[in-house]
């Protein structure tokens, strides 16, 4: 039979510049001598010879003189290969081929890695920064392998995904320099962190920059928004109210108005230096241009979608700045429930039936209540499931399993917790005339 050759299942991870051992072993039979051994290491794909042992002698490295066997351990079945000063180009699969009387082979993977340097951060522009200014933050980390994953987040740890451009360039040694650029509109204060992750080493290198824009001696602008969330029906338009008090002599040329998503800092709409810069949010937003000069910075959001739900920050900068966040709560009414009964014929008292109540295209998730004809809640044996469609609207299906009495009315109430809207349906089940004793 074939000779059994063992190698590790998982790739061998080696840092660039260090030595790596590609383990390989076989089980020598009693009386085995090295004169009988043929050992060949080769690159799996190209079959290029790496190292060999034949006719009792180490034939040496055929791989840039950077490989060695463990001669003292060969007789015990240790055919491992030492690879010195690992390079990126060494990454790949190596086959260990052992022949005595029979032969066998197995392949081991070498995964090369190099840690990324602590990122350096640059800010452009880096002086005379004001709220509302757009800045470019560059995060650079060097000499890593393999390609990095780069993550940006704000001071609260919230991921920043919009307006990020990441490029990775390999040098002559195959190591990567990574440059990631975040373009962001400045708020009052901001900490921006860049995390460079080596996916193989699971090593994170991070740096952050805190930007404090210049303040005016004349003091902050007071910005007012409603305390309660703005509730908007899906498909309708919503107004996110925001106002400030303009000083005498105020002109729109002095105004920087920015609406952005509070969490991600994604730009929604802006007005700068006397001009509406337009919607950066799927062209569904508008300001009230005729009212801006009076301090009305409200935002109109058209054709509201479920995905719009969340907090929007209204950021006003004149000489100085102020900001406030308003919450948008999206809602959609649930349809009148449809009721199905299974089984739905030849029903007798004592039969178990399943009543399904279905209501469609509501938001947010519904509360479902069952009750009998006397208004007594039915809580046992109820299973409710809610599934969101592509638009994020929920279809709700609630199943009641009940044992029939003589007659019964079963009502299902689907409540939208935001709209405080109740949609209900009911079914009345009249059993067959009863005979005593009931027929089997």
């Amino acid at each position: 039979g074939a000779l059994e050759v063992q190698v590790p299942e998982d790739p061998v991870v080696a840092l660039v510049g260090t030595d790596a051992t590609l383990c390989c072993s076989f089980s020598p039979e009693p009386g085995f001598s090295l004169a009988q051994l043929n050992l060949i290491w080769q690159l799996t794909d190209t079959k290029q010879l790496v190292h060999s042992f034949a006719e009792g002698q180490d034939q040496g490295s055929a791989y840039a003189n950077r490989t060695a066997l463990f001669p003292d351990l060969l007789a015990q079945g240790n055919a491992s290969l030492r690879l010195q000063r690992v390079r990126v180009a060494d990454e790949g699969s190596f086959t260990c081929f052992v022949s005595i009387r029979d032969f066998g082979s197995a392949a081991v993977s070498l995964q090369v890695a190099a840690p990324y340097s602590k990122p350096s951060m640059t800010l452009e522009p880096n002086k005379d920064l004001r709220p509302g200014d757009t800045v470019t933050i560059t995060c650079s980390s060097y000499q890593g392998y393999p390609e990095a994953e780069v993550f940006w987040q704000d001071g609260q740890g919230v991921p920043l995904t919009g307006n990020v451009t990441t490029s990775q360039m390999a040098n002559e040694q195959g190591l990567f320099d990574v440059h990631s650029i975040l373009r962001v509109v400045l708020g009052a204060n901001g900490t921006y962190s860049c995390l460079v992750r080596n996916p193989v080493l699971q090593q994170d290198a991070h740096s952050s920059v805190t930007i404090t824009p210049q303040r005016s001696p004349t003091g902050a602008v007071e910005v007012q928004v409603p305390e309660d969330p703005v509730v908007a029906l899906v498909g309708t338009d919503a107004t996110l109210r925001c106002s400030f008090s303009p000083e005498p002599g105020f002109s729109l040329a002095q105004l920087n108005l920015i609406w952005q998503l509070t969490d991600t800092k994604q730009l929604v709409h802006s007005f700068t230096e006397g001009r509406d810069q337009g919607s950066a949010y799927a062209n569904r937003t508008a300001l009230f241009p005729d009212l801006l000069a009076q301090g009305n910075a409200s935002l109109r959001l058209q054709r509201v979608r479920v995905a719009d739900e969340g907090s929007f920050t209204c950021f006003v900068s004149i000489r100085d700045f102020g900001s406030a966040a308003v919450s948008l709560q999206v809602a959609a009414p649930y349809s009148k429930p449809s009721m199905t009964l299974e089984p739905n014929k030849d029903l007798r008292p004592g039969d178990t039936v399943t009543i399904t109540c279905s209501s469609y295209r509501g938001y947010p998730e519904a509360e479902v209540f069952w009750q009998d004809g006397q208004g007594v809640p039915l809580t046992g044996n109820v299973t409710t499931s809610q599934m969101a469609n592509e638009q994020g609207l929920f279809d709700v299906h609630s199943v009641l399993r009940v044992v029939l009495g003589a007659n019964g009315t079963y009502s299902c109430l689907v409540r939208n917790p935001v709209l405080q809207q109740d949609a209900h349906g009911s079914v009345t089940i009249t059993g067959q005339p009863m005979t005593f004793p009931p027929e089997a």
Epitope: E124, P125, K127, D128, R130, D133, T134, V135, T136, T138, I181, R183, Q214, S216, P217, T218, G249, S251, A253, Q254, E273, G274, Q277, R319
Partner: antibody
Framework: QVQLQQPGAELVRPGASVKLSCKAS????????MNWVKQRPDQGLEWIGR????????RYNQNFRDKARLTVDKSSSTAYMQLSSLTSEDSAVFYC?????????WGQGTTLTVSS | DIQMTQSPASLAASVGETVTITCRTS??????LAWYQQKPGKSPQLLIY???TLEDGVPSRFSGSGSGTHFSLKINSMQPEDTATYFC?????????FGGGTKLEIK
């Protein structure tokens, strides 16, 4: 180091157009607005307009709206200003300068001579 | 547009003398004023921004002050290399506007 390179001189005929260039290096081109400023001999400085290289958004001085057109080529980190329907009044030194409120780096200027 | 009035249009000063140039604006521009120096045959160079912040590498004999509509540039101890034309510029509004310039010469 930051550099804004402009050709030294351009000679053009009246009525013609000219496209002045400003090649940026030593910084992230898309991070700063690029401004253009006109200076006539022994006269003051006039702001023509500016362009955001990131998305090519422009702002113009109304006095130059029909005279100048600003563009950029991000791949070569170069800003351009096209001046049309040239007259002797357009003979001047034209500078590019980066920044929003402060112009911290300026090109050496291109001397435009409009003459037949 | 915001009008910028700079004075004097020209002056001559001796080495070591203190020089003051003023700039007035037609409306309140808070503190968004910059000063530039232009030597003959050269492009302008930023000296001061935000009315009083000295640009990196600018000698400390230069200083700026003012806010609202009245601003000044002061050169403590005039040096021969300070021979140049000085411009103020407002950054409060678009279009950006410059003062007419002050030509400073050595006496």
């Amino acid at each position: 180091q930051v550099q804004l390179q402009q050709p030294g001189a351009e000679l053009v005929r009246p009525g013609a157009s000219v496209k002045l260039s400003c090649k940026a290096s030593g910084y992230t081109f898309t991070a700063y607005w690029m401004n253009w400023v006109k200076q006539r001999p022994d006269q003051g400085l006039e702001w023509i307009g500016r362009i955001d290289p990131y998305d090519s958004e422009t702002r113009y001085n109304q006095n130059f709206r029909d005279k100048a057109r600003l563009t950029v080529d991000k791949s070569s980190s170069t800003a351009y200003m096209q001046l049309s329907s040239l007259t002797s009044e357009d003979s001047a030194v034209f500078y590019c300068a980066r920044g929003v409120r402060i112009f911290d780096y300026w090109g050496q200027g291109t001397t435009l001579t409009v003459s037949s | 547009d915001i009008q910028m009035t700079q004075s004097p249009a020209s002056l001559a000063a001796s080495v070591g003398e203190t020089v003051t140039i003023t700039c007035r604006t037609s409306e309140n521009i808070d503190y968004t004023l910059a000063w530039y120096q232009q030597k003959p045959g050269k492009s302008p160079q930023l000296l001061i921004y935000n009315a009083n912040t000295l640009e990196d590498g600018v000698p400390s004999r230069f200083s700026g002050s003012g806010s609202g509509t009245h601003f000044s540039l002061k050169i403590n101890s005039m040096q021969p290399e300070d021979t140049a034309t000085y411009f103020c510029k407002q950054a409060y509004d678009v279009p950006r506007t410059f003062g007419g310039g002050t030509k400073l010469e050595i006496k």
